[in-house]
């Protein structure tokens, strides 16, 4: 049994880091493998993560962690029974993938304006709370070419757009994701999408 692709890990900078790797053949990850992880500080002890299968030869492990600080560094040991398959380290602050925003809502009751709001996925005492910016993706269910991205570079989790920038009488979907420039994070996963019917009063043409 060998590791084909070494574990790569990302942290949500809150309480979970996710490590993924591939074995050289079909593996029952939860019964055959264990990932041990230990914070490199005095009196810290190793914790055990039981991996799950992620495709035939792929494994994924969700490591429980404390609130992350930039000094945190973990040793990682991947074991198959008594055999050490791989040894590495992981600094969560250098591999951050934010949590996905939630509760995306489209408010259509403001005259001729669409207000999209969502929730910041972090509590106010987390460092990332005040450092997230967002991308909002809006697309038409009827027309695959009608696909747009709005970058939200301010802190408020909301976006206002004129309803007239979208076609009237058509159903649209929206989703949002986040990233934090300060930690050069990857983008979060997209939030669940929300759907609405876009309708607005066409202005009378002046002749």
């Amino acid at each position: 049994m060998k590791v084909l692709q070494e574990p790569t890990c990302v942290s949500d900078y809150m309480s979970i880091s996710t490590c993924e790797w591939k074995m050289n053949g079909p593996t029952n990850c939860s019964t055959e493998l264990r990932l041990l992880y230990q914070l490199v500080f005095l009196l810290s002890e190793a914790h055990t993560c039981i991996p799950e299968n992620n495709g035939g030869a792929g494994c994924v492990c969700h490591l429980l962690m404390d609130d992350v600080v930039s000094a945190d560094n973990y040793t990682l040991d991947l074991w198959a029974g008594q055999q050490l398959l791989w040894k590495g380290s992981f600094k969560p602050s250098e591999h951050v993938k934010p949590r996905a925003p939630g509760n995306l809502t489209v408010h259509t009751n403001v005259s001729d304006t669409l207000l999209l709001t969502w929730s910041n996925p972090y509590p106010p005492d987390n460092y990332l709370y005040n450092h997230l910016t967002y991308a909002v993706n809006i697309w038409s269910e009827n027309d695959p070419a009608d696909f747009r991205i709005y970058n939200v570079t301010y802190l408020e989790p909301s976006l206002r757009i004129a309803a007239s920038t979208l076609k009237s009488g058509i159903s649209y979907r929206a989703r949002v994701r986040a990233w934090a420039q300060c930690y050069n994070t990857t983008w979060s996963e997209w939030s669940p999408s929300t759907k609405w019917h876009n309708s607005y009063r066409e202005p009378f043409e002046q002749h």
């Epitope: 914070l39 490199v40 500080f41 005095l42 009196l43 810290s44 002890e45 914790h47 429980l64 404390d66 600080v69 000094a71 945190d72 560094n73």
Partner: antibody, heavy 117, light 112 residues
Framework: EVQLVESGGGLVQPGGSLRLSCAAS????????VSWVRQAPGKGLEWVSA????????YYADSFKGRFTISRDNSKNTLYLQLNSLRAEDTAVYYC????????WGWGQGTLVTVSS | DIVMTQSPLSLPVTPGEPASISCKSS???????????LDWYLQKPGQSPQLLIY???FRAKGVPDRFSGSGSGTDFTLKISRVEAEDVGIYYC?????????FGGGTKVEIK
């Protein structure tokens, strides 16, 4: 919210014994090392002993080895310190504290041990 | 054992003025990743100690930004930029480099 509540302190005669307890809540107790730290009246802080999260590793300051014993019951979320052969100079407030990143990220309110005849 | 030496023993301060406490260790607390294994704690009158600064310079959650930690190796400083009445108490440094964990003797900060 991390909560640590010590109990078991009291008045004991020199040469006597006492068992201190520390009830933990608000966090996954078994994931953390915990320590006992004491403070004699009007004096500074003195580290006594620590125990790893699983209970398998224990650590003591030299002056307490052989007289004090640290233990934990993770099923009860409780830390213990058995004090034997007590002396007048062991009179102190005994605190339990949760470890993280080497230091103490959460303290109990303390329990007073008085050794006197 | 690592010996921690704090100065001054007592520090009378005026509210609004800065204050500084020194802590020296008998051996280096700097580790390979560039972090110093030193914490600062405050024990307010009648209370348990509370963590202020960890790893030499990182403020613990909820600690006002008027508190800052600096230094490296064997010489460390805790600074309060503008002392407030609620800052009175005894300040301790502690090394987390090895067991036994050792504290400085404490610095009592009181209002003039």
């Amino acid at each position: 919210e991390v909560q640590l509540v010590e109990s078991g302190g009291g008045l004991v005669q020199p040469g006597g014994s006492l068992r201190l307890s520390c009830a933990a809540s608000g966090f996954t107790f078994s994931r953390y090392a915990v320590s006992w730290v004491r403070q004699a009246p009007g004096k500074g802080l003195e580290w006594v002993s620590a125990i790893g999260g699983s209970g398998g590793r224990t650590y003591y300051a030299d002056s307490f080895k052989g007289r004090f014993t640290i233990s934990r019951d993770n099923s009860k979320n409780t830390l213990y310190l058995q004090l034997n052969s007590l002396r007048a100079e062991d009179t102190a407030v005994y605190y339990c504290a949760r470890h993280l990143r080497g230091g103490f990220w959460g303290w109990g309110q303390g329990t007073l041990v008085t050794v006197s005849s | 054992d690592i010996v921690m030496t704090q100065s001054p023993l007592s520090l009378p301060v005026t509210p609004g003025e800065p204050a500084s406490i020194s802590c020296k260790s008998s051996q280096s607390l700097l580790e390979g990743q560039g972090y110093n294994r030193l914490d600062w704690y405050l024990q307010k009158p009648g209370q348990s100690p509370q963590l202020l600064i960890y790893l030499g310079s990182f403020r613990a959650k909820g600690v006002p930004d008027r508190f800052s930690g600096s230094g490296s190796g064997t010489d460390f400083t805790l600074k309060i930029s503008r002392v407030e009445a609620e800052d009175v108490g005894i300040y301790y440094c502690m090394q987390t480099s090895e067991t036994p964990l050792t504290f400085g003797g404490g610095t009592k900060v009181e209002i003039k």
